[in-house]
């Protein structure tokens, strides 16, 4: 039994790091393998992660952490019974994938304006709380070409757009994801999408004279 692709890990910079690897053949990850991880710090105990299968030869493990600071470094040992298959280390701050934003809501009660709000996925004591920026994806269920990305580069988890920038009388969906420049993170997963019916009353003389900017990402 050998490791074909060494473990690579990403951290949510709060409580979970996810490590994935591939073995050289079909493996029952949960019964045959164990991933031991330990924070390199005083008093830190070794923890055992029981991996799950991720495809025939692939394994995935979710490492639970109480907290995280920038300087953290973990040792990782992959065992098959008494055999050490691989030894490595992992710095969560260097491999961050933020948590996805939640509670995306579209407020349509403001005249001619759409207000999209969502929740920051981190508590205020987490460094990323004040460092996330967002991308909001809005698309039409009726027209696949009507697809746009709004980059939200300020900290407030909200976006205002004029209802008239979207077509009236059809349904739209929106979703949001996050990243943090400070740790050069990857993008988070998209939030669950939310749906609304876009309707607004357009002044007759302006009808069909709007210029739409479609931002592709």
């Amino acid at each position: 039994m050998k490791v074909l692709q060494e473990p690579t890990c990403v951290s949510d910079y709060m409580s979970i790091s996810t490590c994935e690897w591939k073995m050289n053949g079909p493996t029952n990850c949960s019964t045959e393998l164990r991933l031991l991880y330990q924070l390199v710090f005083l008093l830190s105990e070794a923890h055992t992660c029981i991996p799950e299968n991720n495809g025939g030869a692939g394994c995935v493990c979710h490492l639970l952490m109480d907290d995280v600071v920038s300087a953290d470094n973990y040792t990782l040992d992959l065992w098959a019974g008494q055999q050490l298959l691989w030894k490595g280390s992992f710095k969560p701050s260097e491999h961050v994938k933020p948590r996805a934003p939640g509670n995306l809501t579209v407020h349509t009660n403001v005249s001619d304006t759409l207000l999209l709000t969502w929740s920051n996925p981190y508590p205020p004591d987490n460094y990323l709380y004040n460092h996330l920026t967002y991308a909001v994806n809005i698309w039409s269920e009726n027209d696949p070409a009507d697809f746009r990305i709004y980059n939200v580069t300020y900290l407030e988890p909200s976006l205002r757009i004029a209802a008239s920038t979207l077509k009236s009388g059809i349904s739209y969906r929106a979703r949001v994801r996050a990243w943090a420049q400070c740790y050069n993170t990857t993008w988070s997963e998209w939030s669950p999408s939310t749906k609304w019916h876009n309707s607004y009353r357009e002044p007759f003389e302006q009808h069909h004279h709007h210029h739409h900017h479609h931002h592709h990402h």
């Epitope: 409580s15 907290d67 920038s70 300087a71 205020p124």
Partner: antibody, heavy 116, light 112 residues
Framework: EVQLVQSGAEVKKPGATVKISCKAS????????MHWVKQAPGKGLEWVGR????????IYASKFQGRATITADTSSNTAYMELSSLRSEDTAVYHC?????????WGQGTLVTVSS | DIVMTQTPLSLSVTPGQPASISCRSS???????????LEWYLQKPGQSPQLLIY???NRFSGVPDRFSGSGSGTDFTLKISRVEAEDVGVYYC?????????FGQGTKLEIK
């Protein structure tokens, strides 16, 4: 041996500013959060705030926001707390504490007396 | 802010007898990562506080097994199965789940 050694007692006049230090040995402060806890004479413990020494990220209890400033110098392995616009109710022992992820190591405390 | 309320505020116990201190939080102290950062500290006379229990039930290294923690949600308890003379001091519960972190007001344990 792990130790947090704090600077000595201070006597200050109302309105003044005090800065107390906390030097760590036996571990690197970059590996922890450094907190400060207040204990007024004969009273209980009150959390002031904390810093991540690596990136300087601080959070404070609202009561101390704007008057307390926590800093850290990773090269000297030392955390600091500055308290400005001192008043009599700031008279207390201030403890520095390392948290990872609980308060395992406490400094001996620094008594700050505010008196005219 | 989350208020941590301890009862009783003082306790006088005969050596060898059990003691129990309650700590109630004004709202849930489950962190968004799913853990409950409820801790117990003992401050002996003239000393800095020392950690006894972390994450509700876990004894810190070197803490005698006569100390135990329990509870969930908003109600937590520290029990000493057989009080010894060296256990005198003020016991504080603490929540480290939500900013601002907060301590209970303290429970003073004396020996009869």
């Amino acid at each position: 041996e792990v130790q947090l050694v704090q600077s000595g007692a201070e006597v200050k006049k109302p309105g003044a500013t005090v800065k107390i230090s906390c030097k760590a040995s036996g571990f690197n402060i970059k590996d922890t959060y450094m907190h400060w806890v207040k204990q007024a004479p004969g009273k209980g413990l009150e959390w002031v705030g904390r810093i991540d020494p690596t990136n300087g990220y601080t959070i404070y209890a609202s009561k101390f926001q704007g008057r307390a400033t926590i800093t850290a110098d990773t090269s000297s392995n030392t955390a600091y707390m500055e308290l400005s616009s001192l008043r009599s109710e700031d008279t207390a022992v201030y403890h520095c504490v390392s948290r990872r992820p609980w308060f395992a190591y406490w400094g001996q405390g620094t008594l700050v007396t505010v008196s005219s | 802010d989350i208020v941590m309320t301890q009862t009783p505020l003082s306790l006088s116990v005969t050596p060898g007898q059990p003691a129990s201190i309650s700590c109630r939080s004004s709202q849930s102290i489950v962190h968004s990562n799913g853990n409950t950062y409820l801790e117990w500290y003992l401050q002996k006379p003239g000393q800095s506080p020392q950690l006894l229990i972390y994450k509700v039930t876990n004894r810190f290294s070197g803490v005698p097994d006569r100390f135990s923690g329990s509870g969930s949600g908003t109600d937590f308890t520290l029990k000493i199965s057989r009080v010894e003379a060296e256990d005198v001091g003020v016991y504080y519960c603490f929540q480290g789940s939500h900013v601002p972190y907060t301590f209970g007001q303290g429970t003073k344990l004396e020996i009869k």
